[in-house]
Interface confidence: low
């Protein structure tokens, strides 16, 4: 059976595309939507049944320099009486984001994209129980 | 992190701020971390504030696929497996940076874009407003 010809197979590169050396890409780090703000419910990190704390990590050779990481406060979850229930588990919820890393090699500076895994908050889950034979 | 000291013989072009436009290596660090939350854990099903994951795809963006969480219930799941409306399932949102093709359709030219994603849900005690 003759395989039908695959159609137009690539984004047409517009004439306006900037020239870029091989193996690299041009990145404008002026952020689109820079002033967008998170509109999460108030103090959810304290009101959650799986509460968490925030830590700010700072690195001058990373853009953005500040990355906020959450850490679950408990192994278990907080019950209606305000006590920790260890029959349930507080677990971290994670999300990837991109950062730009600045590297110094001798007198030259290079830039590298990096995926960073950010812990955003915690959720309360029923544990998986493994039964040993 | 610390700023790596420069060789004293280097021209003094060190700038504490990042330049507006940079050329970056196409290779990405930590690129093999798992990007599909459905594959990385089943918390979305086991949580007391479970959520569904919706695929958001945009070929002009990297990553082209982002998963958005939507809480399944207003309340939370109690020990009996029922929805308890005395508690609230709320989304946990996070600003992340992605790459946007700029100009559009160009293979190797991007701009950073900040987007707001709902990553999962958590169960919270509601704020009760008492009306006088």
């Amino acid at each position: 059976r003759k395989i039908p010809k695959v159609g137009h197979t690539f984004f047409q590169k517009p004439e306006s595309c900037p020239p870029v050396p091989g193996g690299s890409m041009k990145l404008d780090i002026g952020i689109i939507n820079e002033n967008q703000r998170v509109s999460m419910s108030r103090n959810i990190e304290s009101r959650s049944t799986s509460p968490w704390n925030y830590t700010v990590t700072w690195d001058p050779n990373r853009y953005p320099s500040e990355v906020v990481q959450a850490q679950c406060r408990n192994l278990g979850c907080i019950n209606a009486q305000g006590k920790e229930d260890i029959s349930m588990n507080s677990v971290p919820i994670q999300q990837e984001t991109l950062v730009v890393r600045r590297k110094h090699q001798g007198c030259s500076v290079s830039f590298q994209l990096e995926k960073v895994l950010v812990t955003v908050g915690c959720t309360c889950v029923t544990p998986v129980i493994h039964h040993v034979q | 992190g610390i700023t790596i000291p420069r060789n004293p013989g280097c021209p003094n072009s060190e700038d504490k701020n990042f330049p507006r436009t940079v050329m970056v290596n196409l290779n990405i660090h930590n690129r093999n971390t798992n990007t599909n939350p459905k594959r990385s854990s089943d918390y979305y099903n086991r949580s007391t504030s479970p959520w569904n994951l919706h695929r958001n795809e945009d070929p002009e963006r990297y990553p082209s696929v982002i998963w958005e969480a939507k809480c399944r219930h207003l309340g939370c799941i109690n020990a009996d497996g029922n929805v308890d409306y005395h508690m609230n399932s709320v989304p946990i949102q996070q600003e992340i940076l992605v790459l946007r093709r700029e100009p559009p359709h160009c293979p190797n030219s991007f701009r950073l874009e900040k987007i707001l994603v709902s990553v999962g849900c958590t169960c919270v005690t509601p704020i009760v407003h008492h009306v006088a």
Epitope: P4, V6, G7, H8, T9, F10, F11, K13 | L26, N27, I28, R31, N32, N34, T35, N36, R39, P59, R61, Y62, P63, S64, V65, L99, P107
Partner: nanobody, 122 residues
Framework: EVQLVESGGGLVQAGGSLRLSCAAS??????MGWLRQAPGKEREFVAA????????YYADSVKGRFTISKDNAGITMYLQMNSLKPEDTAVYYC?????????????????WGQGTQVTVSS
Amino acid sequence: EVQLVESGGGLVQAGGSLRLSCAASGRTYDAMGWLRQAPGKEREFVAAISGSGDDTYYADSVKGRFTISKDNAGITMYLQMNSLKPEDTAVYYCATRRGLYYVWDSNDYENWGQGTQVTVSS
């Protein structure tokens, strides 16, 4: 949906060569790639080529030994594998994707072939 059919796998001695082929039919794509999975390991990126054929990408572990190419019609993609090593033993998959963002991110490939076994004996 793109249909993909791989061929060309087999058993070869270390230092030998193989040529894999992948025939594509159906929807358009921006890039085609070869990915592999060794027993008990994660699926990993090997090489990719843009739909236009202008851009090729290789994993560090195969650079200089493997060459990816495609025919002018964009229907068949090839992976010429030279100087094969025992650690190249794996099931090799052909896959397509939209966008050339990071062709080495195996999670972003949408359509996969059934795979072809490559075994390199020492």
